[in-house]
Amino acid sequence: LQDPCSNCPAGTFCDNNRNQICSPCPPNSFSSAGGQRTCDICRQCKGVFRTRKECSSTSNAECDCTPGFHCLGAGCSMCEQDCKQGQELTKKGCKDCCFGTFNDQKRGICRPWTNCSLDGKSVLVNGTKERDVVCGPSPADLSPGASSVTPPAPAREPGHSPQ
């Protein structure tokens, strides 16, 4: 014999108190699959959480975090405090990146500046707490004759002949 509850669609529950007829989920509850004997209570996005998607009779509410926080975990189970760019979150709260490190996001850790010399390059733009260094061409590339763009010859002072 087929279970009469199997005919109850999502958004309803099989009501044992009413001869197993399909009743709609009460307010603030949902059933995402058919054949359910109860509806689940909707998640409430309060406090540090805010509603990203309202609960419906067939799907749970979805939360994200209020401004100043970002989501952690599947389904945004927790929130983590944001910091400013140039900072990282520590046990004592947000702290500035140490010299030689940077963070260009509101989350995550400060990372060391790129070491341009490891790639045989020079520093074109210095790093900051918020930005990595920008590496330029290698010093060898900057020597005269090594580049397709020839730098102008230095101006000679009058009365001096080349050595």
């Epitope: 998640r43 409430q44 309060k46 406090g47 540090v48 959480f49 926080f69 952690l72 975990g73 189970s77 927790m78 929130c79 983590e80 405090q81 979150l89 520590t90 046990k91 004592k92 709260g93």
Partner: nanobody
Framework: EVQLVESGGGLVQPGGSLRLSCAAS????????MGWVRQAPGKGREFVSA????????YYADSVKGRFTISRDNSKNTLYLQMNSLRAEDTAVYYC?????????????????????WGQGTQVTVSS
């Protein structure tokens, strides 16, 4: 056996201060996110503040921001709530709660279902 024991409540005049404590035992305190929740007579639960397991992230409800400070001492297994500039509307029973956040040491939550353990509460009355 897990225990959360609140203390520090009492009667205080408007504008006054109180410091609530919550002594925890029976679980690895530093792995648990903690929260303070209050319930005024005839009203629902309100999450006042929350703090991550390592103390790095903190959350405050708008109604207490700038007046209350949450902190924890993991060496003493104790959670605190420093309450300044108290108002009549802060009158409530204050509960501390603990939820396992081992995976997210900087995580906070204000979802009651996240919290595994709850204290018995301490009464705070703000009245002249």
């Amino acid at each position: 056996e897990v225990q959360l024991v609140e203390s520090g409540g009492g009667l205080v005049q408007p504008g006054g201060s109180l410091r609530l404590s919550c002594a925890a035992s029976g679980f690895t305190f530093s792995s648990y996110a903690m929260g303070w929740v209050r319930q005024a007579p005839g009203k629902g639960r309100e999450f006042v503040s929350a703090i991550s397991g390592n103390g790095g992230s903190t959350y405050y409800a708008d109604s207490v921001k700038g007046r209350f400070t949450i902190s924890r001492d993991n060496s003493k297994n104790t959670l605190y709530l420093q309450m300044n500039s108290l108002r009549a509307e802060d009158t409530a029973v204050y509960y501390c709660a603990a939820g396992d956040a081992y995976v997210y040491p900087y995580g906070v939550s204000t979802d009651p279902s996240f919290y595994d353990y709850w204290g018995q509460g301490t009464q705070v009355t703000v009245s002249s």
